[in-house]
């Protein structure tokens, strides 16, 4: 992965934090829940994009090259993004215009933008379906899918905002 | 792992009621959705009835729409099945069966050891 100009961190920080809340919003569960405590082996289910030790996110990875763990963060989003726009979400029970939801992906597509490089080219993946007989999993699905993207934004955030704190770039006073 | 028991099964005429029970124990905080399957002889297992566990929205298969309702109760950690208007069509080992989170697919992983239920004409 080359070097490359580095984001705005400080937008990135605050729209992963309003990410974060939104995911929230869209989906709360009752009761206890440990976002980050998931188990070694349910780590590569489906292919889900998880933000790991090799992916360069921790301090001294994002200080030597940060593109490692950005590359690995636009991953996530677009994986996300992806299933926000499949018939999971969009299929019955509909979601209402201005709902949690739809703020959500306006913000995902938001944070995607500011991290997609000019020249970056767009991965394809398949568009999830649900058959006739598999109709009645579609808020399950999107519960458990809104749960994992809470993990992955909980630990984004935390990229960002050591981002923001350590790697902005010092302004410049001008004579 | 999710532990499941089921209990309530027994024999009863056509038109009769009964109420199933799933006593759910262990990783209980990662339970996405608790479900009921059911197995007649000779047939594949089907889908009967789910129920979110953090939401509580439910999803019936269209044949015992209007005549089974699954309910819970979280501070049990238990769901159950009201079963109304029987048909002999209805006779099976029910199963209670959990999808926990991880991934981002329905996935009933752990299942009970079913409970008997037969109609008679």
């Known amino acids: 992965v080359p070097r490359s100009s580095s984001p705005d961190w400080a937008q990135c920080q605050q729209l992963s934090r309003n990410l974060c809340m939104l995911a929230w919003n869209a989906h709360a569960p009752a009761g206890h829940m440990n976002l980050l405590r998931e188990e070694e082996d349910e780590e590569t289910k489906n292919n889900v994009p998880r933000i790991q030790c090799e992916d360069g996110c921790d301090p001294q990875g994002l200080k030597d090259n940060s593109q490692f763990c950005l590359q690995r963060i636009r991953q996530g989003l677009a994986f996300y993004k992806h299933l926000l726009d499949s018939d999971i979400f969009k299929g019955e029970p509909a979601l209402l215009p201005d709902s949690p939801m739809e703020q959500l992906h306006t913000s995902l597509l938001g944070l995607s933008q500011l991290l997609q490089p000019e020249d970056h080219p767009r991965e394809t993946q398949q568009m999830p379906s649900l058959s006739s007989s598999q109709q009645w999993q579609r808020p399950l699905l999107r519960s458990k899918i809104l749960r994992s993207l809470q993990a992955f934004l909980a630990i984004a955030a935390r990229v960002f905002a050591h981002g923001a704190a350590t790697l902005t770039e010092p302004l410049v006073p001008t004579a | 792992e999710v532990q499941l028991v089921e209990s309530g099964g027994g024999l009863v005429q056509a038109g009769g009621s009964l109420r199933l029970s799933c006593a759910a124990s262990?990783?209980?905080?990662?339970?996405?959705?608790l479900g009921w399957f059911r197995q007649a002889p000779g047939k594949e297992r089907e889908f009967v009835a789910a129920v979110n566990w953090s939401g509580g929205n439910t999803y019936y298969a269209d044949s015992v729409k209007g005549r089974f309702t699954i309910s819970k109760d979280n501070a049990k950690n238990t769901v159950y099945l009201q079963m109304n208007s029987l048909k002999p069509d209805d006779t099976a080992v029910y199963y209670c069966?959990?999808?926990?989170?991880?991934?981002?697919?329905?996935?009933?992983?752990?299942w009970g050891q079913g409970t008997r239920v037969t109609v008679s004409s």
């Open positions: 262990g990783r209980t905080f990662s339970i996405n959705a």
């Open positions: 069966a959990a999808d926990e989170y991880g991934g981002i697919s329905v996935d009933f992983g752990s």
